[in-house]
Structures are given as structure tokens and as C-alpha cells.
């Protein structure tokens, strides 16, 4: 930008150097050059000379007018054509910016990842503002009425050490930029209700050599939470449809889940857990790929035809995956897979 320019005059912008995108803008240039009565005053935008909508107001001042200015940033400067000078003489320059006031932050979510020592809050910022926009996260204790505020750009991590005075909080986010300010809805948070168990990991899988081969998937977590509810989803790599099994897990030992799967097929497994009865899910674990052994018997097993699982298992759901071109998203999950419903929203999907 042109922030440290030595001006021989002045340049100013109406309605201001930061304005709403699409507005009409007037930029004025006023020379104060010694030993020069300029024949012409010229405007440049991003280094290119402007030809249109320039008005000479008087001997020292000119204006350029832009209809519906829609560039997020521009570098303006103006020059004078002085008699007897081969080159134009610089008068002044300005950085100008256009953008939008912020939308009210939406979908505010706060979680504590087990062992992290932080409460992580995220939100949707809405449409791009194109200008510097800051977010002020307000955390107010419902017990002591004390309020803490944190500045952020897109999310915030708040040390649980600073949340020791209380368990219940009101959290909201204020979006602020040069063109406006908006508040999110307030979120009621109980620190005991927002813990996401330590990551669940599928460590290995094996297929037995029985007459009816079964696949055993081994998975674990370092969580200290006693009551954990988990989902494991699985599908062949060629399939778009996930099958989902649900478990009550106890991670004092490695979990074993048994499946009767199609022989000689490549399967993808993923697992995620939440504290039983709570709202927030882990992200799906990294995809674990396992090749089942070749068929020995003749029976054609379907993954959902005979679901047997080592732990207590509820209904198996069919969930259709999104496009395989979708990038892997490791994001906070706050939606359960409803039995028999298609996957939507925050699910991390593997094609």
C-alpha cells in the first residue's frame, strides 16, 4: 500500500477510506506544490492511469468519481503535470478498501477436547466482509456474573484455568469491523456437558479363517470418561453407502467389534464417540482400510444381513456417502446419525 508517502498536497475519499462495497465513491486530490501551476491533475488506481469521470474543480483540486466501486482494495495516487517538467509530479496517495458489515455469527459451538485444557469455540462468520473483521468472544459466568472477553479471527481457545470460578457460562460472539457490528445468539454452556472424549483409534483388524469368516476390528481411546457411546461406520471402498453400528464402550480395555462381511473385499472403517447422553461427537477417526480374505464357503454375506458385534449393539443404519471428491474435513461434530436417514451436515465422509 501507500502508507508512508510524502504528500505535496492532500487526497481524501468520500464517504471514507473504508466503505461499503458497491457504493459510489469520490476521491479528491488537492495539490500544494511549490513552483507549479499544474496543467493537469491525474489519478492512478493500482498504478494505472484513469481516463474517465475526472472533474477539475479548481486550479488546485480534482475529483474522480466511481460508480458502484466493488474492488476490495485499491491503491490510489494522483499526480500533477507541471509546465517545464518532463515527468509528472506526485501529489499524494491513499489505500482504499471496500467491503461489507459483518453478519451475525451463527452456529456458535463450544467444546472441551479431553486433556486439551481448553474450551474451543467456533462459529460461522457468514459472508466474506473483505475488510479486517475481528470477533470478540464474551464468556460470562452465570454464577459470579463476571465476564471475560477474547479477541479472535475465526475461533478461540480459552484455557480452562481461566474458567475455574464457575461451571455454567453464557457465551456469545460479537463481530466488529469498520462498517458495523453484530452479535451472535447466546449459548448456554455447562463445562461438564461439552467434553469430547479423547480420540478413538482403530488399531487393527483381522479376518478369521472360519467356515463363516468374521472380521474383528480392534479400537481404543485414552479417554477417562466412563460412559461412552460410539458409532462405527463401514463400507466397501467401491460403495457409496455406509453401514453404521452403535456401541456402549468401556475403554478400560481394547474394544473388539465383530462383523460378517463380503469376502475378498476392501472395507473402510471409521469410529467416533461421545460421552453418553451428551451432544458433541468426536470427528470420525482416520479411515482404516481392511481387506477381507478370499471366499472359502459359497454363501454371499451382506454386511447388514447378520450384524453381530462383541459389545451391546443397537440398530444398523444405512448412510449414503457424499461425493468422493469432497476433501477430508476434520471438524467438530454436533449431529448424530439418525437411523435410516441420509448423512448430512457435518459428517466427515469418505467416498
Amino acid at each position: 500500500g501507500i502508507t508512508s508517502i510524502n504528500c505535496s498536497g492532500d487526497m481524501w475519499v468520500e464517504p471514507g477510506e473504508i466503505f461499503q462495497m458497491g457504493m459510489n465513491v469520490s476521491i479528491y486530490c488537492q495539490e500544494a506544490l511549490k513552483h507549479c501551476r499544474p496543467r493537469n491533475l491525474y489519478f492512478y488506481k493500482n498504478g494505472f492511469k484513469e481516463e474517465f469521470d475526472i472533474t477539475r474543480i479548481n486550479r488546485t483540486t480534482a475529483r474522480i468519481w466511481y460508480k458502484g466501486f466493488s474492488e476490495p482494495h485499491a491503491y490510489m495516487h494522483c499526480t500533477a503535470e507541471c509546465p517545464g517538467h518532463f515527468q509528472e509530479t506526485l501529489i499524494c496517495g491513499k489505500d482504499i478498501s471496500s467491503g461489507h458489515p459483518p453478519d451475525a455469527p451463527s452456529n456458535l459451538t463450544c467444546v472441551i477436547y479431553e486433556y486439551s485444557g481448553n474450551m474451543t469455540c467456533t462459529w460461522n462468520t457468514g459472508k466474506p466482509t473483505y475488510i479486517d473483521t475481528k470477533y470478540i468472544v464474551h464468556v460470562k459466568s452465570l454464577e459470579t456474573e463476571e465476564e471475560q472477553q477474547y479477541l479472535a479471527s475465526s475461533y478461540v481457545k480459552i484455557s480452562t484455568d481461566s474458567l475455574q470460578g464457575s461451571r455454567k457460562y453464557l457465551v456469545w460472539v460479537q463481530a466488529v469491523n469498520s462498517l458495523g457490528m453484530e452479535n451472535s445468539q447466546q449459548l448456554h454452556v455447562h463445562l461438564d456437558d461439552i467434553v469430547i472424549p479423547s480420540a478413538s483409534i482403530i488399531s487393527r483388524a483381522e479376518t478369521t479363517n472360519d467356515t463363516v469368516p468374521k472380521t474383528i476390528v480392534y479400537w481404543k481411546s485414552k479417554t477417562m470418561i466412563e460412559k461412552v457411546f460410539c458409532e462405527m461406520r463401514y463400507k466397501t471402498t467401491t460403495n457409496q453407502t455406509w453401514s453404521v453400528k452403535e456401541f456402549d464402550a468401556n475403554f478400560t480395555y481394547v474394544q473388539q467389534s465383530e462383523f460378517y462381511l463380503e469376502p475378498d473385499s476392501k472395507y473402510v472403517f471409521q469410529v467416533r464417540c461421545q460421552e453418553t447422553g451428551k451432544r458433541n461427537w468426536q470427528p470420525w477417526s482416520s479411515p482404516f482400510v481392511h481387506q477381507t480374505s478370499q471366499e472359502t464357503g459359497k454363501r454371499n454375506w451382506q454386511p447388514w444381513s447378520s450384524p453381530f458385534v462383541h459389545q451391546t449393539s443397537q440398530t444398523v443404519s444405512q448412510v449414503t456417502a457424499k461425493s468422493s471428491h469432497e476433501p477430508q474435513k476434520m471438524e467438530m461434530l454436533s449431529a448424530t446419525i439418525f437411523r435410516g436417514h441420509p448423512a448430512s451436515g457435518n459428517h466427515q465422509d469418505i467416498g
Epitope: 470478540i136 465476564e147 471475560q148 472477553q149 477474547y150 479477541l151 479472535a152 481461566s162 460479537q174 466488529v176 457490528m181
Partner: nanobody, 116 residues
């Protein structure tokens, strides 16, 4: 109770510098976000800058690149470094709790006058 006392103002020429201080007591300063606001003669209150408990900062466009807010938790003191001062920075400066807002809670303030 909360007490805030500003100091460091004075008369300075355009282009000059000043450092304002705000001594705080009566609350847990290290966990508290703070701000500076100002009131020019005959005008309303204007928010200037804010800082949160971790040192993240935010500035009004009119002072961005010229003013710097900071806080010293050991001394329970908030600072505002004013550089490249302009005549339009002439105002009474107040500190207040919270990152953002054009209000203050009744402290006395410190006068900054920029004049040649």
C-alpha cells in the same frame, strides 16, 4: 470496587508522541479485557483500541498504525502509546473494562492536546 486512573496526557506538537497509562485496582486485571476511549471537544465518545487478557489487540481505523495498546499484568497497568499525533487526536482519553464500546465508567481521564 473497580478503580481506574489515567495519566500521561499533555501538550504535544503534530507528529509527536505520548504514552498514556491507566492504573487499575479492585478486580482481577490479568483476566480482564480493557479498552481506551476518547472524547474530542464538543463531540461524542469514540472507541480507540482494545486488548484482551492474552494480549490480542484491536484498533479503530483512525488510529491504526499510529497507536499501540498494551497491558502489564504485574503492574496492573494498561498503556496506550500514541505516535505520529495529529490535531484530530486532541481529546480526553479514558480507560475502561472490556475490549470494545464507546462508553467508560466514570474515571477522570487524561487530556491530550495536539497543537503547533
Amino acid at each position: 470496587q473497580v478503580q481506574l486512573q489515567e495519566s500521561g496526557g499533555g501538550l504535544v506538537q503534530p507528529g509527536g508522541s505520548l504514552r498514556l497509562s491507566c492504573a487499575a485496582s479492585g478486580f482481577t486485571f490479568r483476566l480482564t479485557a480493557m479498552r481506551w476511549v476518547r472524547q474530542a471537544p464538543g463531540k461524542g465518545l469514540e472507541w480507540v483500541s482494545g486488548i484482551d487478557s492474552r494480549g490480542s489487540t484491536i484498533y479503530a481505523d483512525s488510529v491504526k498504525g499510529r497507536f499501540t495498546i498494551s497491558k502489564d499484568n504485574a503492574k496492573n497497568t494498561l498503556y496506550l502509546q500514541l505516535n505520529s499525533l495529529k490535531t484530530e487526536d486532541t481529546a480526553m482519553y479514558y480507560c475502561a473494562q472490556g475490549v470494545y464500546g464507546d462508553t467508560y465508567s466514570g474515571s477522570l481521564g487524561t487530556q491530550v492536546t495536539v497543537s503547533s
